[in-house]
């Protein structure tokens, strides 16, 4: 089945510069591999700055979204650019910065509950053709005022791990994002390689829960490098936790 | 309030092609995915495509090929380009969206196509 | 893909009675912790609703009287006590793989 071929970890535990939380720390949830780009720009400064070409915000780091970097520039060429603070511009949410969101074109302030500010609210920001394919995931548009004061639960749909309540991370599933269970000890997951082959990730799980990582199974040393299980392990050392 | 408002449906003949849309409203539709889920009549439901908020499409092999799925951010448009159509792609046509969760959580009315000669 | 079987293919039975629906998949509809089943309802001429996802989560506004529950490969839906607009065709749905199969619904009319 598809699933087989589909099915994957990539979350944490991907090696630079393919991402994962290493490049950015507060994000449960590293850029999800895109069908036609791995990953996305982890180690993006102002000295050392290389564009990373993507197809979706996704792809992107917490802190970016996908676009074309000149203003109505060829939709073809697209790079992570850096997220937009607040009172700056916007498009959609994730062109805003952790913590804000997209209202009236605009990047506001949020609360946690910060994606329940679009109840029953069209927002439909004209800014010309650019962007207008390149659009990625969205918070949650929440439309029953009893989900107004918790945060995404399984199966909900996320644009970061912050929008998901604790214990879940925002991962992919078909063509949204959504609130997964972090992975538990000895749970199956998927560490990638450097030069791995991504390009067909649209099933995600969570990476592993904290003082875990992801190793391969100790009685699957032995088989091919392609049929190696990796699981959820306890670390042997204190370093490298993660933090939801 | 959430909207999704189909059109576009009609009678061709097999072989021929169709352009079905979607009109949304009352969500910012350029960050949500959305699909096409039609019904034959008198029968169960039936996914044919989907589309990311980033543009990346979707099919069941039913339909690869013959249907390609589209969407218009800055109209706030969804579209399903129907060609080499047969008797049994005969259907209401709904598009649907997941706007709260992974399934389908809000659906248009639907329209009607009918392949006959 | 994934086969979704529902039975029974029709239920009678009266305002206030309890209804219990039942969707059985070709192999498990779980990962990654969730089990990926979704109910609808669909009423005559109109679009479907979604009542149920993730095997036992209510859709927004939906009445409490209908819940799910099951994991794997068996799940059920039900109606604690049928209201005279309850009446209508109900459908499960896995999205665990692609592509998302439905099952051939299960008819609950008046008795």
């Known amino acids: 089945t598809l699933n087989s071929v589909l099915n994957s970890n990539a979350i944490k535990n991907l090696p630079p510069p393919l991402g994962g939380a290493a490049g950015h720390p507060g994000s449960a949830v590293s850029a999800a591999p895109g069908i036609l780009y791995p990953g996305g720009n982890k180690y993006q400064t102002i000295d050392n700055y290389q564009p990373y070409p993507c197809a979706e915000d996704e792809e992107c780091g917490t802190d970016e979204y996908c676009a074309s970097p000149t203003r109505g520039g060829d939709a073809g060429v697209q790079i992570c650019l850096a997220c937009r603070k607040r009172r700056k511009r916007c498009m959609r949410h994730a062109m805003c910065c952790p913590g804000n969101y997209c209202k009236n074109g605009i990047c506001v302030s949020s609360d946690q509950n910060h994606f329940r500010g679009e109840i029953e609210e069209t927002i439909t920001e004209s800014f010309g053709n650019d962007h207008s394919t390149l659009d990625g995931y969205s918070r949650r548009t929440t439309l029953s005022s009893k989900m107004y004061h918790t945060k995404g639960q399984e199966g909900s749909v996320c644009l970061r791990s912050s929008d998901c309540a604790s214990g879940l991370c925002c991962a992919r599933h078909f063509w949204s994002k959504i609130c997964k269970p972090v992975l538990k000890e000895g749970q199956v997951c998927t560490k990638h390689r450097r030069k791995g082959s991504h390009g067909l990730e649209i099933f995600q799980r969570c990476y592993c829960g904290e003082g875990l990582s992801c190793r391969i199974q100790k009685d699957h040393h032995q088989a091919s490098n392609s049929s190696r299980l990796h699981t959820c392990q306890r670390h042997h050392h204190h370093h490298h936790h993660h933090h939801h | 309030e959430v909207q999704l408002v189909e059109s576009g449906g009609g009678l061709v003949q097999p072989g021929g092609s169709l352009r079905l849309s979607c009109a949304a409203s009352?969500?910012?539709?350029?960050?949500?995915?959305i699909s096409w889920v039609r019904q034959a009549p008198g029968k169960g439901l039936e996914w044919v495509a989907s589309?990311?908020?980033?543009?990346?499409?979707y099919y069941p092999d039913s339909v690869k090929g013959r249907f390609t799925i589209s969407r218009d951010n800055a109209k706030n448009s969804l579209y399903l380009q129907m060609n080499s159509l047969r008797a049994e792609d005969t259907a209401v046509y709904y598009c649907?969206?997941?706007?709260?969760?992974?399934?389908?959580?809000?659906w248009g009315q639907g329209t009607t196509v009918t392949v006959s000669s | 893909e994934i086969v979704l079987t529902q039975s029974p293919a029709t239920l009678s039975l009266s305002p206030g009675e309890r209804a219990t629906l039942s969707c059985r998949a070709s192999e498990s509809v779980d990962d990654f912790g969730i089990s990926f089943m979704n109910w609808y309802q669909q009423k005559p001429g109109q679009a479907p609703r979604l009542l149920i996802y993730?095997?036992?989560k209510q859709g927004s506004g939906i009445p409490a009287r209908f819940s799910g529950s099951g994991s794997g490969t068996d799940f059920t839906l039900t109606i604690s006590s049928l209201e005279p607009e309850d009446f209508a065709v109900y459908y499960c749905q896995q999205s665990k793989e692609l592509p998302p199969t439905f099952g051939g619904g299960t008819k609950v009319e008046i008795k």
């Open positions: 589309v990311s908020g980033g543009g990346r499409t």
């Open positions: 649907a969206t997941s706007l709260e969760n992974y399934a389908f959580d809000y």
């Open positions: 009352g969500f910012t539709f350029s960050s949500y995915a």
């Open positions: 993730a095997a036992s």
